[in-house]
Each structure stands twice: as C-alpha cells, then as structure tokens.
Amino acid sequence: GKGDPKKPRGKMSSYAFFVQTCREEHKKKHPDASVNFSEFSKKCSERWKTMSAKEKGKFEDMAKADKARYEREMKTYIPPKGETKKKFKDPNAPKRPPSAFFLFCSEYRPKIKGEHPGLSIGDVAKKLGEMWNNTAADDKQPYEKKAAKLKEKYEKDIAAYRAKGKPDAAKKGVVKAEKSKKKKEEEEDEEDEEDEEEEEDEEDEEEEEDDDDE
C-alpha cells in the first residue's frame, strides 16, 4: 500500500544495484559536484551495455538476494486494515477514457524509464509533464483528437449503461432531480480521475517490477 512504512522495500534489479554503485563511486570521486542526472544515466547505461556477463554477475547476485529478501518479507507483511477493501465498482461499468496527456504518457513512459533507469516514478511523471508542457499545441492535437474520440465513445457507453440501470438504482427508482444528478456525475468524475491516477501509478509500479535489464 502507498505510504505504509511497514511495507517491505521493493526489490531492486541488477541494473538498479549497478546504478547505485555508480552513484556511490561518483560521490567518492566528486563529493562536492552536483550530478547532471541525464548525463549520469547515459554514462551508466553505456557502461552497463559494455560490461561482460561476469562483471554483471556480482549485481545479478545482489538482485537475487534482494528478491529473496523481498519475497521473505512479503510473506509476513500484513497490509493495513481497509487497504484491500476498495469501494465497490461495477466491473461492467464503462472505463473512464484517458486524457490526451495520459495517452501521451503511455506512449513515452517506456522511453523515459528506459533511458533513465534510476528515475523514481515521480521523476518519470515530472519529465513527462515537462515534455508535454514543451509541446506545441498542434503537436498535442493527435492525442487530443484520440482522447476526444474515446470520450465520445465513453459518453455513449455510460449513457447506455445508465439506461440499463445500475444494480441498486432499480430499487431506488430512476427519477432524480436534475441538480442532484449533475452533482453525482461531478463526484463520479472526480472519483474516476483519482482512479485513473491511481491506476497509472500501479501500472508504473508493476512495470518497474517487470522491467528486464537489457
């Protein structure tokens, strides 16, 4: 769970151990120098690519040991109460469409994560945000067009879904004041936006665990 201090630290890949070692070496050699992260990542990546299997072995062993530690700790880890209980969401409900920025992130997140393996999820998001903000309006158009199409489809699907009636809506009667209907939709939109961000974070965490070293 997010923010649980008792949750075991995520397992580190062999490449992550290598980057950590690089960083420590760099700090020893240049204790006062500030690190140009882009350059540093690039140099690390280039060095890793030229290393022999034997040289990488040390880091692979560290990663194996860390994986074992993580699995061991996860066996005894009990998530905080309520964490596993998510509010009920009808699995058949149409999924909220992604925003233009979300589509853009899906496209370029692998590149950013791949080129800068040491970046945290937050830093990856920050870099993607910078890329998006530095993008001219006409370059954003393809993503905006696609997002608009998906939104249109979602609106049709959600209208059909609501017309069919939600599991509990039938009991309560469908007639509602326009005002409360509008309010409810706004709340749902807010909830869905939170979910979208949460899903993106989860996806990121999963990807990080799945990423194989090159």
Epitope: F104, E107, P110, K111, N134
Partner: antibody, heavy 117, light 110 residues
Framework: EVQLLESGGGLVQPGGSLRLSCAAS????????MTWVRQAPGKGLEWVSS????????KYADSVKGRFTISRDNSKNTLYLQMNSLRAEDTAVYYC??????????WGKGTTVTVSS | DIQMTQSPGTLSLSPGEGATLSCRAS???????LAWYQQKPGQAPRLLIY???KRATGTPARFSGSGSGTDFTLSISSLEPEDFAVYYC???????????FGQGTKVEVK
C-alpha cells in the same frame, strides 16, 4: 551496436508502388519515435514521415500525404514506408532515423528509390 | 508552416579559417527545437548541435551554435580538412517528430 538498415529501394514506374523496410538492432526499438527522411539527387534533406513508439500516432509531409503510409512492427524491430502512386519527384535516397539517448541520433545508410519510365 | 532559410548557399574558405553559417526561421522558434547537421558526400547526415547551442556526442569543440527567436548561427572556429561538407539547420516539432530542414550551406575548399 546501434544500427538501422534500410532495404526495399529500386526502380519503379510512375504510379507504381514500393515498400521500404528499416531493420533496427542494438536498442529497444519499441521505446522510440521513428522517422523517414529523403534526399533527392544533389538536393537537400526532406523530412517524409514519423511514427510514435506504439505506432498509434503518425505524421506526414504534405508532399506525401495520402500516398505514403508509415508503420512499424515492434515485435520484428522493423519500420516500414509503403509508397503508392509514386512520382518522378519521389526519386531520392530514403533514410530511416531515430533519436537515441538525448539527441544522439542514429541514421541508416539509406536506400535508393528511382521513379522513372 | 515554418520555413528555415540558410545563408550563404556556399562558403569558400581555407583550412584554418573560421566559418559563420546563418539560419533564419520564418517565425520565432524555440531554441529547444533547433539543431545543426553535417553531411559529407555519400554519407548520412550527422547531428552536430542540438537545442541551438549544445554539442552532440562526438562534436569537436571548434563547433558552436548560438541564437534565439528567428536567427541562429553555427560557427566553426578553425576549419579542419574534415569540416568541408554541407551543413543543415533543422527545426523540429515533437511527438512524433516533424522536421523542417534549411536548404543547406556548402562549405568548400577555396
């Protein structure tokens, strides 16, 4: 070693079709935008088309819009350019290129397309 | 659409001399998206300068880029024999890229 290798060029009659391929190796192809640039004999460089990492987004120069189609197969690490309704002015060396690690861009050696009757 | 115009078309110089190549955009562009390429006969182009003034990997220190808005310059402090080539300025849009090249400046031996 990072490499791009174009193929599929040749002599074709006006109105004909040709499909260029670009085989990529030495990097994670599916992370990167890919681009075709061409150069007519004795002339300058002209951007032709680009495609996003997933292949979901494409852009074309006005001179080729509606006639050329860029696509990619990430499972095969290959970029394509389907060229239809070819004209004499499409005669050029076609380069496949990508940006790799902070503006260190990589270009293929090019493949020659000649449109002539 | 943005047009990039380079001048002069040809520059005749001797080794050891300095060179100044100019590139003008038809409207103001961000220096983030301005690059310079070098191309030798029978070879693919090679990136020299990106973001108007940053040297790409492997670009010698004698090459420098400057400028902002609509006017950009590539300078070669002292020409080496291998610097005689055609130079292109390039403006880019992103994601996926859309590139606009200038028509090129040929630097030839006097």
């Amino acid at each position: 070693e990072v490499q791009l290798l174009e193929s599929g060029g040749g002599l074709v009659q006006p109105g004909g079709s040709l499909r260029l391929s670009c085989a990529a190796s030495g990097f994670t192809f599916s992370w990167y935008d890919m681009t075709w640039v061409r150069q007519a004999p004795g002339k300058g460089l002209e951007w032709v088309s680009s495609i996003s990492p997933s292949g979901g987004y494409t852009k074309y120069a006005d001179s080729v819009k509606g006639r050329f189609t860029i696509s990619r197969d990430n499972s095969k690490n290959t970029l394509y350019l389907q060229m239809n309704s070819l004209r004499a002015e499409d005669t050029a060396v076609y380069y496949c290129t990508t940006e790799f690690y902070d503006y260190l861009d990589v270009w293929g050696k090019g493949t020659t397309v000649t449109v002539s009757s | 659409d943005i047009q990039m115009t380079q001048s002069p078309g040809t520059l005749s110089l001797s080794p050891g001399e300095g060179a100044t190549l100019s590139c003008r955009a038809s409207q103001s562009v961000s220096s983030t998206y301005l690059a310079w390429y070098q191309q030798k006969p029978g070879q693919a182009p090679r990136l020299l300068i990106y973001e108007a003034s940053k040297r790409a990997t492997g670009t010698p220190a004698r090459f420098s880029g400057s400028g902002s808005g609509t006017d950009f310059t590539l300078s070669i402090s002292s020409l080496e024999p291998e610097d005689f080539a055609v130079y292109y300025c390039q403006h880019r849009h992103n994601w996926p890229p859309q590139w606009t090249f200038g028509q090129g400046t040929k630097v030839e031996v006097k």
